[in-house]
């Protein structure tokens, strides 16, 4: 906290600019205007500041918007913004994707801080719902923006938002993030021809149920192995070993080495070892011929 | 993070010349601007010059056409090169760097001015 000096003779600030740099922190308290900052916020940013510079400056705003600043300082807050607490964004109502992209640009580069957390909660739950040119704007800087939403949170993204998503935003999703974005982007992509579907569908691939990954194996998709074991396993299981050729097509020979991993190992125990063998891989671990295999999921579900 | 090292203090001669550097180390692409403060014994610490990346610089009037301040990036050195020294510089001189998202500061080089 900045002791309250009077302001030394002929250093009272009539605009800012470069000069204040050398201001000490007592002086910038004592001669710099609230309201001539907040005028002037677009200026700060292009002088260097000290960051002990722009705490005296952040507690002259808080000063005059006790109640949390107006969008138009908050857009040109540059680097102040990095002086910001989750606290004082909570006060703030930013409504501009200008101002956002402006405040994202600041910690471009740097992992999501706190602060921008709250930000981009903020402006989200201000906007209802997450839409396709937020969402692009959050992925260009947070390429893990989309994963690090819960599956709850995940069910505001309107379908139309899913043409935005690239498939790197999508390599630290979990199964359930999937679940949730499967759907959607099944629903996006629905009048696109075979083989462009099958390229935008892909990353999304990991929420599918059985019966989509059936009509995929029908469009000679040639699905990749790293694809096919991100795949949810109980997706996988009820696959034939004709409907899984079809559906890898080249790629089936990757699935030897990957015999030992789920879903290919889940997959092989419920496959007939005939069957498994009509792939000439190799493949071991299915069921003898001659053994019956009862679904007791399906005989519950009945009873 | 991002370490700073100053050198070259020491005692001298009204009117003569310093050159003080300062090495910068670890996180350094995140740096904005750096610059050299000093303080005097018993007074606030001031800043003398500032540099930003792009290579304007910003000089205290009780400085100018003295001291010149610069950067060698390929070295990752910043550099004040101080002529014309008068008793009033003799300070600690501090080298600060202003990263994402704080200031760093070195542990200061003892300038003396003294015939």
């Known amino acids: 906290e900045v002791e309250k000096t009077a302001c030394p003779s002929g250093k009272k600030a009539r605009e800012i600019d470069e000069s204040l740099i050398f201001y000490k922190k007592w002086e910038l308290e004592a001669c710099v205007d609230a309201a001539l900052l907040a005028t002037q916020m677009d200026r700060v940013n292009a002088i260097p500041f000290t960051y002990e510079q722009l705490d005296v400056l952040k507690h002259k705003l808080d000063e005059l918007y006790p109640q949390g600043y107006p969008e138009s300082v908050i857009q040109h807050l540059g680097y102040l913004f990095l002086k910001m607490s989750p606290e004082d964004i909570r006060k703030w109502n930013v409504t501009s994707l200008e101002t956002l992209k402006a405040l994202l640009e600041v910690n471009k580069g740097h992992e999501m801080s706190p602060q921008v957390a709250t930000l981009i909660d903020r402006f989200v739950k201000g906007r209802g719902q997450l839409d396709k040119d937020t969402l692009d704007t959050l992925t260009a800087f947070y390429p893990g923006y989309l994963c690090s939403l819960s599956p709850e949170e995940l069910s505001s993204v309107p379908p139309s938002s899913i043409w935005a998503v690239r498939p790197q935003d999508l390599d630290t999703c979990d199964p359930r993030q999937l679940d949730v974005l499967y759907p959607k982007a099944r629903l996006a992509f629905q009048n696109m021809n075979g083989s462009e579907y099958f390229v935008k569908i892909q990353s999304f691939l990991g929420g599918a149920p059985t019966e989509d990954l059936k009509a995929l194996s029908q469009q000679n998709v040639s699905m990749d192995l790293a694809t096919f074991m991100k795949l949810r396993t109980d997706a996988v299981l009820p696959l034939t070993v004709a409907e899984v050729q079809k559906l890898l097509g080249p790629h089936v020979e990757g699935l030897k080495a990957e015999e030992r991993h789920r879903p290919v190992r889940d997959w092989i125990l419920r496959q007939r070892q005939d069957d498994l063998d009509t792939l000439g891989l190799g493949l071991q671990g299915g069921i003898p011929n001659g053994y019956l295999v009862l679904d007791l999921s399906m005989q519950e579900a009945l009873s | 993070e991002v370490q700073l090292v100053e050198s070259g203090g020491g005692l001298i001669q009204p009117g003569g010349s310093l050159r003080l550097s300062c090495a910068a180390s670890?996180?350094?692409?995140?740096?904005?601007?750096m610059g050299w403060h000093r303080q005097a014994p018993g007074k606030e610490r001031e800043l003398v010059a500032t540099i930003t990346t792009v290579g304007t610089t910003y000089y205290a009037n009780f400085v100018k056409g003295r001291f010149t301040i610069s950067r060698d990036n390929s070295k990752n050195t910043l550099y004040l090169q101080m002529n014309s020294l008068r008793a009033e510089d003799t300070a600690v001189y501090y080298c600060?760097?202003?990263?994402?998202?704080?200031?760093?500061w070195g542990q200061g080089t003892l300038v003396t001015v003294s015939s």
């Open positions: 670890g996180n350094i692409g995140s740096i904005r601007h």
């Open positions: 600060r760097a202003t990263a994402h998202p704080t200031d760093y």
